[in-house]
């Protein structure tokens, strides 16, 4: 069973009184429809809440919106609907919050059918004031902020026009027509695809990829025969149609599309897809769908150029229908990812990698749990994690796995213990070491969140009945206390805490229902008095990440270095505080063959760490194309894994081979690219 409230648990003294003094209720005086909540800025305490109520009438939809603002993390709210002239706000566009601490907010309003364009309300002072602006177009998408300059906005119109504003939505200019997809790149660059003939759908695979680096003054065609494109880390990817047939291949650029290389990945047919699962400045995880409606594919990991790919995981679950994958980046520990595979018997199993996709294993069985009915052997089984796929299948899983970069090592997830994911009601499990070991934390499904960089974990039971109890733990989920936050239970709809897990406030959202009325209500609880003092040096202990065998000289080495962290002791009840910075100390490891991947034209035979030359491309889908031309490629067969920092040790030296590979790309080479100016 999971740990609970017993004598063995270190109970927080007088917590009921402390929390009661810091529990704030707010009742929203409007009809219950939908509610959306956004945090404006970081550490500002500003929250915007938009409630909308729809009445579908015969000819039209009547709607009413209300906008509320809090500047104390949700303890008090003020109705500011008059600032947006009591206008009905389109919830499908949400609230477009500006990057960083710009304080910018854009709300898109519903306008009557005959109007020339849409309407937005803009604020640049953390929603204290709003300016109404009528648009010269009807927006199709939410306004997109440039990551570099929050005054620059991008939007697509319902007529496929690409519109740009340079003064935070005050004035708009259409910079291109016939646009299908547009994205901000780095340095205020815009990438977009265009169609020539009928429509985006009709021209799929015959689109052009364009770039503008000056907000639409001039343009450059950087690709043709485009199916789609994507940005990940420093990589720009395009899937390009082949000349000969209906297949397409991935091409990659690391210079904003000036030059392209063909990625050494299998080509895909019409019914298949590529998906960038994760990317950073070092490498990318790419999913390549299997032919047929299998619901799975293969994960490949790239080299530092995004060109050479190593097979990472077979039978990776990724549904074609709903586009669901369980692929999760565990942000609380470097190199860790969790995902699901579809077994031959169609059962779903969870896999974890600790070395950025180098090796995948099952999750270790939690010590305090028994194997369930899915296990063939009652003593040998593993933990199966519920993520997006389980949620999409309407299993009793209220939340996806949770981890936070500043709560080192902590991973919280719903799961079951057996040989495969079970449809039975899951429990909540926690790992304090980034996924190496797990413990059952709570019985049954819960909503959960991390506060104060891991100093507090808060949970609420997932129930169809009204609730009035919140659970919290100050020791990374070992022991739990329960607090009744209201006498009158509410129908719970969500748990909200400021993104980044630095806050000590939690908001419980729900509604009350009586015979005639239904009202939104929020309870905000501040845990500051539970963590009475600031943490000191003595409250932290030293922890080596990725440690599996202290007798191994290189224990803890992942991607060429090991990291020691200062972590809060489980028994310390103190505040990390909003300014808490993770203290870590890296140390470089000696290189081994495992720090290298096999370069183009080489592969690793099963259970061998050496890279051997591939038999002359017989039966291998290996085409190499660099910069759109046939190239000479010199290699010694090994290439350092992206992000690997090892030094010394093994240095794989062998004669440098000159590989001349055929280049079958029909993609534009740089000299054929055209430019134009407005």
């Amino acid at each position: 069973s999971a740990p609970g409230e017993d004598e063995e648990c270190g109970r927080v003294r007088d917590f009921v009184a402390k929390l009661a003094n810091n529990t704030h209720q707010h009742v929203f005086d409007d009809l219950r429809g939908s509610v959306s909540l956004s945090w404006v800025g970081d550490s500002t305490g500003v929250i915007l809440v938009l409630t909308t109520f729809h009445v579908p009438l015969v000819i039209m939809t009547f709607g009413q919106s209300k906008l509320y603002r809090s500047e104390d993390y949700g303890k008090n709210f003020k109705d500011i609907t008059d600032l947006i002239n009591n206008t009905f706000i389109r919830t499908e566009f949400g609230m477009a919050i500006g990057p960083e601490n710009s304080g910018k907010v854009v709300l898109t309003a519903e306008v009557s059918g005959g109007s020339r364009g849409g309407r937005i309300f803009r604020s640049s002072d953390f929603a204290k004031n709003f300016v109404q602006t009528d648009l010269p177009f009807h927006p199709l998408t939410q306004m997109m902020y440039s990551p570099q300059n929050s005054d620059y906005l991008l939007a697509l119109s319902t007529e496929n026009g690409l519109w740009v504003s340079k003064n935070f939505g005050g004035k708009w200019e259409e910079i291109h027509k016939a646009v299908c997809l547009a994205k901000w790149g780095s340095d205020n660059t815009i990438f977009f695809t265009t169609y020539a003939n009928g429509s985006c759908k009709a021209d799929l695979g015959a689109l052009e990829l364009w770039r503008t680096s000056d907000l639409g003054k001039s343009f450059k065609t950087i690709g043709v025969k485009i199916y789609s494109f994507g940005l990940g880390g420093r990589f720009l990817f395009a899937s390009v149609m082949a000349d000969k047939d209906t297949t397409r291949r991935i091409h990659v650029s690391t210079d904003q599309g000036d030059t392209w290389s063909m990625a050494q990945l299998p080509s895909v047919g019409q019914e298949q897809f590529y998906s960038i699962l994760a990317a950073n400045d070092d490498m990318v995880f790419m999913h390549v769908d299997e032919p047929g409606d299998t619901g799975f594919g293969t994960i490949f990991t790239s080299d530092d150029r995004g060109i050479v790919y190593s097979k990472s995981l077979d039978r990776h679950l990724y549904t074609t229908t709903g586009g669901e994958t369980d692929f999760t980046n565990v942000t609380s520990l470097r190199g860790v990812y969790i995902t699901s595979v579809l077994s031959e018997d169609n059962s779903i199993q969870t896999m974890i990698t600790f070395d950025q996709g180098g090796r995948w294993t099952h999750l270790r069985k939690p010590e305090n749990s028994e194997c369930d009915a899915t296990a063939k052997n009652k003593n040998e089984c593993s933990l199966a994690i519920h993520a997006s796929y389980s949620i999409s299948q309407k299993l009793n899983v209220p939340m996806a796995p949770l981890s936070e970069p500043n709560a080192v090592g902590i991973v919280i997830a719903h799961g079951s213990v057996g040989d495969a994911i079970s449809v039975m009601v899951p429990d909540v499990y926690i790992s304090d070491d980034g996924g190496y070991s797990w413990t059952k934390m709570l019985e049954g499904p819960h909503y959960y969140t991390i506060l104060d960089s891991g100093g507090i974990i808060v949970a609420i039971e997932h129930s169809s009945r009204p609730i009035n109890v919140i659970k919290f733990s100050t020791d990374e989920g070992q022991c739990w206390q329960t607090y009744t936050f209201t006498r009158d239970p509410i129908y719970f709809t969500g748990l909200a805490s400021e993104p980044g897990a630095r806050s000590m406030n939690i908001s419980i959202w729900g509604f009350t229902e009586s015979f005639l009325t239904s009202q939104w209500v929020s309870y905000t609880i501040d845990f500051k008095d539970i963590l009475e003092r600031n943490c000191e040096e003595k409250d932290y202990t030293i922890w080596l990440a990725h440690s599996t065998d202290p007798e191994d000289y290189e224990d803890g080495c992942i991607l060429g270095y090991k990291e020691q962290f200062l972590r809060l002791r489980k028994s310390s009840v103190c505040q990390n505080g909003r300014d808490y910075v993770v203290t870590k100390q890296p140390s470089i490891c000696l290189c081994s063959l495992e720090d290298f991947l096999c370069d183009f034209g080489y592969y690793r035979p099963e259970n061998d760490s050496k890279c051997v030359e591939q038999p002359e491309l017989k039966g291998h889908d290996l085409e190499f194309c660099l910069y759109g031309r046939e190239e000479h490629l010199t290699t010694n067969g090994y290439r350092k894994i992206p992000g690997d920092k090892c030094q010394g040790g093994v240095n794989p030296v062998r004669e440098v081979k000159d590989l001349k590979k055929k280049c079958t790309s029909n993609f534009l080479s740089p000299e054929k690219q055209n430019s134009k100016s407005n």
Epitope: E8, C9, G10, D433, Y436, S437, D475, Q478, C479, K538, T541, I542, W543, L544, A545, H546, S547, P550, E551, D552, Y553, D555, G556, K562, Q564, R569, K570, S571, S572, Q585, S587
Partner: antibody, heavy 124, light 106 residues
């Protein structure tokens, strides 16, 4: 089998310093914390502080803060404990001990290997 | 710092007796407790770590239990070699030892 061998007995004058060494053999010295524990005649055990050779992270008991310095030399697999401003009540047997480790936590699993002890006598 | 209170300070027992030593922490230390045996003129020897895990090579007559603030070391059947002083040690805060329990011949 891991062994910790400490330097020989020392006789010191009040106000002076003493530096005791602890050399490890037969194991991966760098991956374990080394603690220093002392025991005054007829008294119990008292933890002074510890060090992790990788990165040289040291931490000290409040009582000895400012008076004790613990260091480690990875190349020779040796840990050192220096105690300054000696007084007669510092007369004790000083032990170095390896902190056992089953996970990434360095100090949580007890001290599984001990040195033979170094007697330090402080007398005028 | 976390204080560790060990009781009794002295315990008289005979060979074959079941012996229990308790240790109380001033605040919860989860399971981060170790037990040691020390004989005169010798270095301490680790018996139990993480409250109840037996160190390899230690006879199974030694067992540990407890979690949070209350811990117990039990010797199921006292042997002649077991007459010594026993210390508990917490590892969750800055390390502290209990005052010791001397097990002597009755």
């Amino acid at each position: 089998q891991v062994q910790l061998v400490q330097s020989g007995a020392e006789v010191k004058k009040p106000g002076s310093s003493v530096k005791v060494s602890c050399k490890a053999s037969g194991g991966t010295f760098r991956n374990y914390a080394i603690s220093w524990v002392r025991q005054a005649p007829g008294q119990g055990l008292e933890w002074m502080g510890g060090i992790i050779p990788i990165g040289g992270w040291a931490n000290y008991a409040q009582k000895f803060q400012g008076r004790v310095t613990i260091t480690a030399d990875e190349s020779t697999s040796t840990a050192y404990m220096e105690l300054s401003s000696l007084r007669s009540e510092d007369t004790a047997v000083y032990y170095c001990a390896r902190q056992g480790r089953k996970t990434g936590y360095y100090y949580y699993y007890g001290m599984d290997v001990w040195g033979q002890g170094t007697t330090v006598t402080v007398s005028s | 710092d976390i204080q560790m209170t060990q009781s009794p300070s002295t315990l008289s027992a005979s060979v074959g007796d079941r012996v229990t030593i308790t240790c109380r922490a001033s605040q919860s230390i989860s399971s981060w407790l170790a037990w040691y045996q020390q004989k005169p003129g010798k270095a301490p020897k680790l018996l139990i770590y993480k409250a109840s895990s037996l160190e390899s090579g230690v006879p199974s007559r030694f067992s540990g239990s407890g979690s949070g603030t209350e811990f117990t070391l039990t010797i199921s059947s006292l042997q002649p070699d077991d007459f010594a002083t026993y210390y508990c040690q917490q590892a969750d805060g800055h390390i502290t030892f209990g005052g010791g329990t001397k097990v002597e011949i009755k």
